[in-house]
Amino acid sequence: VSITKCNSDMNGYCLHGQCIYLVDMSQNYCRCEVGYTGVRCEHFYL
């Protein structure tokens, strides 16, 4: 799978994580920080 950094317009897309662009799948993906979940890393869990 080809990946690259997200475009600058997606700054802030991932609330608590790193935004990765999955080129072949035509979509952005959030790699969440520890303790966060959700499509955009918006949920905190203990």
Epitope: T4, S8, D9, M10, Y13, Q27, E42
Partner: antibody, heavy 116, light 106 residues
Framework: QDQLVQSGAEVKKPGASVKVSCKAS????????IQWVRQAPGQGLEWMGR????????KYREKFERRVTITADTSTNTAYMELSSLRSEDTAVYYC?????????WGQGTLVTVSS | DIQMTQSPSSLSASVGDRVTITCKAS??????IAWYQQKPGQAPRLLIQ???TLQPGVPSRFSGSGSGTDYTFTISSLQPEDIATYYC????????FGGGTKVEIK
């Protein structure tokens, strides 16, 4: 199956406002950005602006900044685009477009006609 | 705002010809360019994103290339069903469409 269903065609008088809705099904708009694009008859595509429904943040093309308002109601999974002070040049098909989780998934378009 | 200058605005070619359309951005868009095909009365159809990644179901005669500010869209062998208007779109910093290229059969 993911869908963006837009409201029906509108006819408006110059100076009036129009509000176009875009209802999402099959996905949560909070996971995406919703863009708005328009196309006047026989003309090219023109990006108007977008909303991040999760945060409520909006960005607009400079030429529309004073006249357009993009909103989202996450409880009904619906985005809206309101354009005020309509003039004849605003006659166009208006599209909502999902981006973020999937690159550019388009609604069917809404024709807005501005005529006296 | 980033400006996208697309050329030519129209072209006429024969079936089987190679067709090339270019888009020049006013600043580096880091390969974040997509290409759309639009036929009359239809919504635009995404052909290519991230400069050269073909969407599923799109024929391999369509291709894209480029980097920095200069990008190219190519139809290697024009077919009658390719008659349409083609648009580039930069999506690095917000979004801007090129002016479009109307492709006709000679």
């Amino acid at each position: 199956q993911d869908q963006l269903v837009q409201s029906g065609a509108e006819v408006k008088k110059p100076g009036a406002s129009v509000k176009v809705s875009c209802k999402a099904s099959g996905f949560n708009i909070k996971d995406t950005y919703i863009q708005w694009v328009r196309q006047a008859p026989g003309q090219g595509l023109e990006w108007m602006g977008r909303i991040d429904p999760l945060r409520g943040n909006t960005k607009y093309r400079e030429k529309f900044e004073r006249r357009v308002t993009i909103t989202a109601d996450t409880s009904t999974n619906t985005a809206y685009m309101e354009l005020s002070s309509l003039r004849s040049e605003d006659t166009a098909v208006y599209y909502c477009v999902r981006s973020g989780t999937l690159f550019d998934f388009w609604g069917q378009g809404t024709l807005v006609t501005v005529s006296s | 705002d980033i400006q996208m200058t697309q050329s030519p605005s129209s072209l006429s070619a024969s079936v089987g010809d190679r067709v090339t359309i270019t888009c020049k951005a006013s600043q580096d868009i880091h390969k974040y360019i997509a290409w759309y095909q639009q036929k009359p009365g239809q919504a635009p159809r995404l052909l290519i994103q991230y400069t050269s990644t073909l969407q599923p179901g799109v024929p391999s005669r369509f291709s894209g290339s480029g980097s920095g500010t200069d990008y190219t869209f190519t139809i290697s062998s024009l077919q009658p069903e390719d008659i349409a208007t083609y648009y580039c779109l930069q999506y690095d910093n917000l979004r801007t469409f090129g002016g479009g290229t109307k492709v006709e059969i000679k």
